[in-house]
Interface confidence: medium
């Protein structure tokens, strides 16, 4: 789902950030960053290239921008020595994926944006909430959204919908 | 490249179940939907259901329900559907997808006396 | 269950000419309409979802149409590696159903 759909970070609201309890991985998504890990690590060395990075993140859902990747590369192979470890590729990780929505999250996010209690977000809704967030979206990008997540075809995004593109990738 | 490599063919006994899997490569297994379609000599295309890897999320047809038992291993990658009380209406060719892009080769079950 | 329905079993043509291959849906299935080819003793392969969105690596001369209920797969400039039999699927709701299938053959 494109921004529209997304809650404003602290950063555009111009909060401050409190400080966190570190963050955590569930087993389950220690694991799958594994996965990605491993299908960039081919000869099992236990090491990816910093170039590579990108490209694993990417595998895992994330679109880093290149100031976020030169960041990043520099924080964790800061001997320059091309490669990133696994607990490291990890740490990365860990921190990006604990920003992501928790299923009630995704489900109070849900709410705000069916403030008419249909139990559908229609384009009005949509609309209503990217002007509110000041998301400079055209009507043919807010459309293309709800199409994206829209599986039954009938112009709005339910809840299950709306959880599904929120939660996991899909070709359609 | 995504790649789906199905185990081998399988001649079973009526009554019996058969478990055949799916190792998939190339991609994060955990993040796509693994799809599982069944296929009768000469015949059409059957949609059995589906899992999500990532939590074991499932849907079925109902026509499957009962029959079929999706089920993922994310540390060896690999899809398993297990098939029971076979009888011969279940001889056919199954297929894995990823999500129908991406599709295994084919197992084979006969079910025979 | 939505029913996907492909009135022709089989449908004739020659190399160079264009072919369509129709897919009716037993109710409103909006565009969540995916089509597929099939070939003698292979897997299944995706050309075209979203009712009109050609997969990667499939050639242009494969078109998709339709929405609602009824859907067409175009071949234009038929070669003759496109003998196969043809699929349409629905995916607007669970459980996803194909159509019975038309084989193409080559005159």
């Known amino acids: 789902m494109a921004s529209g759909f997304k809650k404003p970070s602290a950063a555009s609201t111009g909060q401050k950030r409190k400080v966190a309890p570190k963050p955590e991985l569930t087993e389950d998504q220690k694991q799958e960053v594994r996965e990605a890990f491993d299908l960039f690590d081919v000869d099992g060395s236990g090491t990816i290239d910093a170039k590579e990075l990108k490209v694993a993140m990417r595998a895992l859902g994330f679109e880093p921008r290149k100031e976020e990747m030169k960041k990043m590369i520099s924080e964790v192979d800061r001997e320059g020595t091309g490669k990133i470890s696994f607990n490291d590729f990890l740490a990365v990780m860990t921190q990006k994926m604990s920003e992501k929505d928790t299923k009630e999250e995704i489900l109070k996010a849900f709410r705000l944006f069916d403030d008419d209690e249909t139990g559908k977000i229609s384009f009005k809704n949509l609309k209503r909430v990217a002007n509110e967030l000041g998301e400079n979206l055209t009507d043919e990008e807010l459309q293309e959204m709800i199409d994206e997540a829209d599986r039954d075809g009938d112009g709005e995004v339910n809840e299950e919908e709306f959880l599904r593109i929120m939660k996991k990738t899909s070709l359609y | 490249q995504v790649q789906l490599q199905q185990s081998g063919a399988e001649l079973v006994r009526p009554g019996s179940s058969v478990k055949i899997s799916c190792k998939a490569s190339?991609?994060?297994?955990?993040?796509?939907?693994m799809n599982w379609v069944k296929q009768r000599p000469g015949q059409g295309l059957e949609w059995i259901g589906q899992?999500?890897?990532?939590?074991?999320?499932?849907d079925y047809n109902g026509e499957f329900k009962g029959k079929a038992t999706l089920t993922a291993d994310r540390s060896s990658s690999t899809a398993y559907m297990q098939l029971s009380s076979l009888t011969s209406e279940d001889s056919a060719v199954y297929f894995c997808?990823?999500?129908?892009?991406?599709w295994g080769q084919g197992t084979l079950v006969t079910v025979s006396a | 269950d939505i029913v996907m329905t492909q009135s022709h079993k089989f449908m004739s043509t020659s190399v160079g000419d264009r072919v369509s291959i129709t897919c009716k849906a037993s109710?409103?299935?909006?565009?969540?309409v995916a089509w597929y080819q099939q070939k003698p003793g292979q897997s299944p392969k995706l050309l075209i979802y979203?009712?009109?969105t050609r997969h990667t690596g499939v050639p242009d001369r494969f078109t998709g149409s339709g929405s609602g209920t009824d859907f067409t797969l175009t071949i234009s400039n038929v070669q003759s590696e496109d003998l196969a039999d043809y699929f349409c699927?629905?995916?607007?709701?669970?459980?996803?159903?194909f159509g019975g299938g038309t084989k193409l053959e080559i005159k």
């Open positions: 997808a990823r999500e129908f892009a991406y």
């Open positions: 190339g991609y994060v297994f955990s993040r796509y939907w």
């Open positions: 109710q409103d299935v909006g565009t969540a």
């Open positions: 699927q629905q995916y607007s709701s669970y459980p996803y159903t």
């Open positions: 979203w009712a009109s």
């Open positions: 899992i999500y890897p990532g939590d074991g999320d499932t």
